[in-house]
């Protein structure tokens, strides 16, 4: 039995930040779970992890340097990513694992969300092109 995940097909990060909501066909209330967000078609980069274990407080971390936070709903986790770069435009997949109570559950792979990171638009004069954001 697999948990189904719904994500927006596309989001635009205008100010180098975005909220990506992962909606699950499962109620996370009073569960021990690990929700994560993965970057790339092969989900090779684990962007952010939100860990919940009954307590009121979520543990949020990234092993790959992303600035992130997480908010928990009954059947959702919203990832808030900050300080994104234009070259981090990619497809992002939500993943969920429920560790307790048994049985262990995880999700069917979702369709993912394309996050398009828009650069901050500067208006340099043609004679003096200003610094471009990486």
């Amino acid at each position: 039995n697999k948990i189904l995940v719904k994500q927006s097909p596309m989001l635009v990060a205008y100010d180098n930040a975005v909220n990506l909501s992962c909606k699950y066909s499962y109620n996370l209330f009073s569960r021990e779970f690990r929700a994560s967000l993965h970057k790339g078609l092969d989900s090779a980069v684990e962007v952010c992890v939100v860990y919940g274990n009954y307590s009121q407080q979520l543990q949020v971390y990234s092993k790959t340097g992303f600035n992130c936070d997480g908010k928990l709903g009954n059947e959702s986790v919203t990832f808030y990513l900050q300080n994104l770069y234009v070259n981090q435009t990619d497809i992002y997949f939500c993943k969920i694992e429920v560790m307790y109570p048994p049985p262990y559950l995880d999700n069917e792979k979702s369709n993912g969300t394309i996050i398009h990171v828009k650069g901050k638009h500067l208006c340099p004069s043609p004679l003096f092109p200003g610094p471009s954001k990486p």
């Epitope: 939100v50 009121q56 407080q57 979520l58 543990q59 949020v60 971390y61 990234s62 340097g65 992303f66 600035n67 992130c68 936070d69 997480g70 908010k71 928990l72 808030y80 900050q82 300080n83 770069y85 954001k133 990486p134």
Partner: antibody
């Protein structure tokens, strides 16, 4: 005037526990992320932990994850750091700091610090 | 994590002279860089945020510049109260990290 005042530091044996407090005033505490940063002569300034504005999420440096917890009481305008299984390398001055604009932002105000010494 | 390297470690100058402090990041931090001043026995004080913005109440003699990996803090004319240790800090990547500091001392 923004003020942050830490307390709770002291001498503790390895393996012991300590609770640090940070009393905030002069701003709307409940709308800001708060952080703990520590300083040692050897390693300089090192970020330790953060908590979001309503206390629902937290992050920790790898060196303290699983040993330290962070919480806040917005009614009392107070931030806490619970330190368990303390090690000699946790010896430092611990500062609480406010993050401007509420999230992963720069630290615009700091407390005066409280010294934690872990030694037998 | 991102490593910030500050240079020089110590700067010996006289009041009235200008000071130039450098901070280099191991990878791009865009403009997400801050500078702090710390005097002995005191907490760090925010001087500059987002590479070039002066914090509230900071005198105009302090200025910051740079983006990507190379940043500079400039003190145009040192006042006696400016002799202290200066740290850079990035918030581009998690976790936030600090440089090891540059001490500005009286020659």
């Amino acid at each position: 005037e923004v003020q942050l005042v830490e307390s709770g530091g002291g001498l503790v044996q390895p393996g012991g526990s300590l609770r640090l407090s940070c009393a905030a005033s002069g701003f709307t505490f409940s709308t800001y992320w708060m952080h703990w940063v520590r300083q040692t002569p050897g390693k300089g300034l090192v970020w330790v932990s953060r908590i979001n504005s309503d206390g629902s999420s937290a992050s920790f440096a790898d060196s303290v994850r699983g040993r330290f917890t962070i919480s806040r009481d917005n009614a009392k305008n107070t931030l806490y750091l619970y330190m368990n299984s303390l090690r000699a390398e946790d010896t430092a001055i611990y500062y609480c700091a406010r993050a401007d604009s509420s999230t992963w932002s720069h630290f615009d105000y700091w407390g005066q610090g409280t010294l934690v010494t872990v030694s037998s | 994590e991102i490593v910030l390297t500050q240079s020089p470690a110590t700067l010996s100058l006289s009041p009235g002279e200008g000071a130039t402090l450098s901070c280099r990041a191991s990878q791009s931090v865009s403009s997400y860089l801050a500078w702090f001043q710390q005097k002995r026995g005191q907490a760090p004080r925010l001087l500059i945020y987002d590479a070039s913005n002066r914090a509230t109440g900071i005198p105009a003699r302090f200025s910051g510049s740079g983006s990507g990996t190379d940043f500079t803090l400039t003190i145009s004319s040192l006042e006696p109260e400016d002799f202290a240790v200066y740290y850079c800090q990035q918030r581009s990547n998690w976790p936030p990290t600090f440089g090891q500091g540059t001490k500005v001392e009286i020659k």
